[in-house]
């Protein structure tokens, strides 16, 4: 509305896997005759306005964010102000603002969504021997080091959802990754298969685990 420099970023969040590099795209339209000496570029955390990376006084001032950020110097003159964030961590998740100042100034915010896939669930049974129809057992489904928090679903061998008597807990480790433990209490039939599905809502990734109880003995599917 003011004729100020127009800064463009993706509307959708940028999804990055933990440990990988992410590019936060940002662009502006340089006017004819534009030179990098005119450019002042600031990347910052949106909420706090804490400096992440800057390009001022005609040069890259470097990373102010754990030395894990970089610009694309060869592309700046064409209006590419994107930021490379290396070795993404859970703590990086959030909104980043790209602030561009040339003759005037403008800004735009881009969201970083961090994700990590969950491991294939391991299944344990308690008690795990001398089982008879009518016994109550607890089946525990454990999946590790995922992000964000998982959705857990249980079903029987016929694909019927099991929603009662399920307790799910999720604990974050020091890196912010979640370990999920879901416990199903069930009364055994003559035989049966019990499956747990751990879903990462961001990656739309499903990790499956199942246990089959056939009187004596019980069998566990081999690990994939």
């Amino acid at each position: 509305p003011t004729g100020a420099v127009e800064v463009q970023v993706p509307e959708d969040p940028v999804v990055a896997l933990v440990g990988t590099d992410a590019t936060l795209r940002c662009s502006f339209s340089p006017e004819p005759g534009f030179s990098l000496a005119q450019l002042n570029l600031i990347w910052q955390l949106t909420d706090t306005k804490q400096l992440v990376h800057s390009f001022t006084e005609g040069r890259d001032q470097g990373s102010a964010y754990a030395n894990r950020t970089a610009l694309f110097p060869d592309l700046l003159a064409q209006g590419n102000a994107s930021l490379r964030l290396q070795r993404v961590r859970v703590a990086d998740e959030g909104s980043f603002t790209c602030f561009v100042s040339i003759r005037d100034f403008g800004s735009a915010a881009v969201s970083l969504q961090v994700a990590a896939p969950y491991s294939k669930p391991s299944m344990t049974l308690e008690p795990n021997k001398d089982l008879r129809p009518g016994d109550t057992v607890t089946i525990t489904c454990s999946s590790y080091r995922g992000y964000p928090e998982a959705e857990v679903f249980w079903q029987d061998g016929q694909g019927v959802p099991l929603t009662g008597n399920v307790t799910t807990s999720q604990m974050a480790n020091e890196q912010g990754l979640f370990d999920v433990h879901s416990v199903l209490r069930v009364v055994l039939g003559a035989n049966g298969t019990y499956s747990c599905l751990v879903r990462n809502p961001v990656l739309q990734q499903d990790a499956h685990g199942s246990v089959t109880i056939t009187g004596q003995p019980m069998t566990f599917p081999p690990e994939a």
Epitope: T2, V7, N40, T48, L51, D104, F105
Partner: antibody, heavy 124, light 109 residues
Amino acid sequence: QVQLVQSGAEVKKPGSSVKVSCKASGGTGGIYLINWVRQAPGQGLEWMGGIIPLFGTANYAQKFQGRVTITADESTSTAYMELSSLRSDDTAVYYCARDQVVATSGVNFGMDVWGQGTTVTVSS
Amino acid sequence: DIQMTQEPSLTTSPGGTVTLTCRSSTGAVTTSNYANWVQEKPGQAPRGLIGGTNKRAPGTPARFSGSLIGGKAALTITGVQPEDEAIYFCALWYSNLWVFGGGTKLEIK
């Protein structure tokens, strides 16, 4: 403690221009936006524009485009707002207000420091 | 033009709690709008109370808090004091400019 001290009251004729100054003192380092905000009698606050003194770049509200010029002199820590083609409805109190572009403390306090205001009266 | 809507006036009692809101014509207010709340009393310059949605400026009493509620910026005063009678303006940042709301006149009875 940062303070913003503005120039004194002005009485101007319609069609003329006025230039108001805003001097920052006390811990003026960092990257700041100096905003100019006015308040006409009995009215609310109205953002006119702002400048980043360190970069010398300014933006203006559409309503004032072409009639307002905001400048800054980094060496004296002073920002200026010049409004031309004055009309009677430009009679107002004009304020400068500091806003952080980058929060060096890691906390964004927003427009936390305001000048005392400069009364501009436009009358024939 | 971006329009911002505040309650024209609100009345509360000393010791009570009151919430002032600020709605934007562009849709939900987000953290990237850096909602500011400014207090103005007769004959005094405006005073910045809250910046960055919920950060109290130095000197702002703890009874003032900022937040986002239902897509609007909000200022809550908990344990209202007689000296809180004033006009409160919100301001939102839109990429390259600030826009002020029309103000809420808070009366303490």
